[in-house]
Interface confidence: low
């Protein structure tokens, strides 16, 4: 790991990678791009999955937060031998399956998909890819696309959440390294701190949630602050203001001393949540404090 910027957000990250015949001589560049990027997501609550597609979509590594499994997954990724057609929709199908099944206990972890392809998708394949990306989106995913070489940016803007969610790499595969920083900056949604982190029992407070990427939501009106109290009840609050690096939120009134509220953020009105290790605790405050 080479230091530099990192992401502390706790969410599910899916890499959907083109392994069709046209990337045969460029797989190393794709692998190193993923490997470098993967190492920059360092939250213990972040899970990762590697999916490859050609004429079929294959989940090379199912969602896991286990760093040893991720290391092994990267080794498997390095061994991939590209070949076949560009059935990108197959990759999104594999992601949607996991998004649904990994989160069926009721609490949904936020999902971020980074899909990489070279080349244009022809008629039906574009239609299917857009359809499957929409299905992933409907399950709460944020979709980014990386287009290398002969891609069609208009197509990718429709597969991704918007044209701002497309990363064009016009200078060929060797230029992939150059976009790692901008992908990290855009795809990272992280909660770093809460101020105050200790509040008075029984009193109403406002909390400033410090972090990054809060304005990456498709609609900032759908951003929510969420407080998971004593690992059981979850209360969602609409923020007073949403900025890229902070949220101003009403804190729930916690009546008893020693209560703990784990801070989470939803970018989609509670459909799914970014988790964090930031905790707000209650203390006894005398009248003079």
């Amino acid at each position: 790991e080479d230091g530099g910027p990192a992401c502390y957000g706790g969410f599910d990250l899916y890499f959907i990678l083109d392994k069709s015949g046209s990337v045969l001589h460029h797989w190393n560049e794709i692998y190193y791009f993923v490997e470098q990027l993967a190492h920059k997501f360092i939250s213990p609550q972040l899970r990762m999955s590697f999916i490859v597609f050609s004429t079929r979509g294959t989940t090379l590594m199912k969602l896991t937060e286990d760093r040893e499994q991720i290391r092994q997954g990267l080794e498997e990724l390095q061994k991939v031998l590209p070949g076949g057609d560009t059935y990108m929709h197959e990759g999104f199908e594999r992601a949607s399956e996991q998004i649904y099944y990994e989160n069926r206990q009721g609490y949904r972890t936020a999902s971020v998909i980074i899909a990489l392809t070279d080349g244009e998708l022809h008629e039906d394949l574009f239609f299917y890819s857009e359809r499957e990306a929409n299905r992933s989106r409907d399950l709460g995913a944020i979709v980014y696309c990386v287009g290398v070489k002969d891609f069609n940016e208009t197509q990718l803007a429709r597969i991704a959440d918007s044209k701002d969610h497309v990363f064009p790499v016009n200078d060929g595969f060797q230029a992939l390294q150059g976009i790692i920083h901008s992908i990290l900056k855009k795809s990272c949604i992280e909660i770093l701190a809460a101020e105050p982190s200790t509040i008075c029992a029984g009193e109403s407070f406002q909390v400033v949630v410090r972090g990054n990427g809060f304005r990456h939501a498709r609609n900032v009106d759908r951003v929510l602050c969420s407080f998971k109290i004593n690992d059981s009840v979850t209360l969602n609050e609409k923020p007073f203001s949403v900025e890229d690096t902070y949220l101003l939120c009403p804190a729930p009134i916690l009546k008893e001393v020693g209560m703990k509220a784990a801070l989470q953020v939803s970018m989609n009105d509670g459909l799914s949540f970014i988790s964090s290790s930031v905790i707000i605790t209650t203390t006894h405050c005398s009248d003079g404090s």
Partner: antibody
């Protein structure tokens, strides 16, 4: 022409395991998605789960951990096991295919009736 | 899970008349909606996929429309062989779910 044929016992005792096999002709189970769908008397159709071309299985959460779907590519068959059955599992059981770029069941077996009774 | 609601439960129509069947999803499923016909003692048969796409071999009198949460299957002029139960299916989200069915019977 693709054809699917279900087979298995028509009567199963409560608490036992229901086992059915679907034999596929005209297509390889190493392509597409191979599903089990059931229909209890007078009830709507219920999707139970599938095994994919790669051998991955996904099942309906309502069946919890009672369901297992396996395949035998050498025989071009896939199978259903449903544990701890009750009379509510009495139904017509269908195997069905859906193709990889779709989510609709385009080919069905004719169905086999399974009664759960002591 | 997504709940599919069909109405009416029974539709009494004379041969040659038009039949309109409705299906409603409990949440937005875009156009991931499929229609099936089932006759007594037979397996369901796919009629329409992705809300409005026709299947080769299915008569042109069957058509579908709608997107989001509200969908319609129309049989423009009922033939004797069309009297059956019709089901809609959510093909958007797992677990795939079916409506309760509409029985089209002879008036």
């Amino acid at each position: 022409e693709v054809q699917l044929q279900e087979s298995g016992p028509g009567l199963v005792k409560p608490s036992e395991t229901l086992s059915l096999t679907c034999t596929v002709t005209g297509d390889s189970i190493s392509s597409d998605y191979w599903n089990w769908v059931r229909q209890a008397p007078g009830q709507r159709l219920e999707w139970m789960g599938y095994i994919s071309y790669s051998g991955n299985t996904y099942t309906n959460p309502s069946l919890k951990s009672r369901i297992t779907i396996n395949r035998d590519t050498s025989k071009n068959q896939f199978s259903l096991q449903l544990n701890s059955v009750t009379p509510e599992d009495t139904a017509v059981y269908y195997c069905a295919r859906y193709k990889t770029i779709t989510s609709m069941f385009d080919v069905w077996g004719q169905g086999t009736t399974v009664t759960v009774s002591s | 899970e997504i709940v599919m609601t069909q109405s009416p439960a029974t539709l009494s129509v004379s041969p040659g008349e038009r039949a309109t069947l409705s299906c409603r999803a409990s949440q937005n499923i875009r156009d991931f909606l499929h229609w099936y016909q089932q006759k007594p003692g037979q397996a369901p048969r796919l009629l329409i996929y992705y809300a409005s796409q026709s299947i080769s071999g299915i008569p042109a009198r069957f058509s579908g429309s709608g997107s989001g949460t509200d969908f319609t299957l129309t049989i423009s002029s009922l033939e004797p062989e069309d009297f059956a139960v019709y089901y809609c299916q959510n093909g958007h989200s797992f677990p795939y779910t079916f409506g309760g069915g509409t029985k089209v019977e002879i008036k």
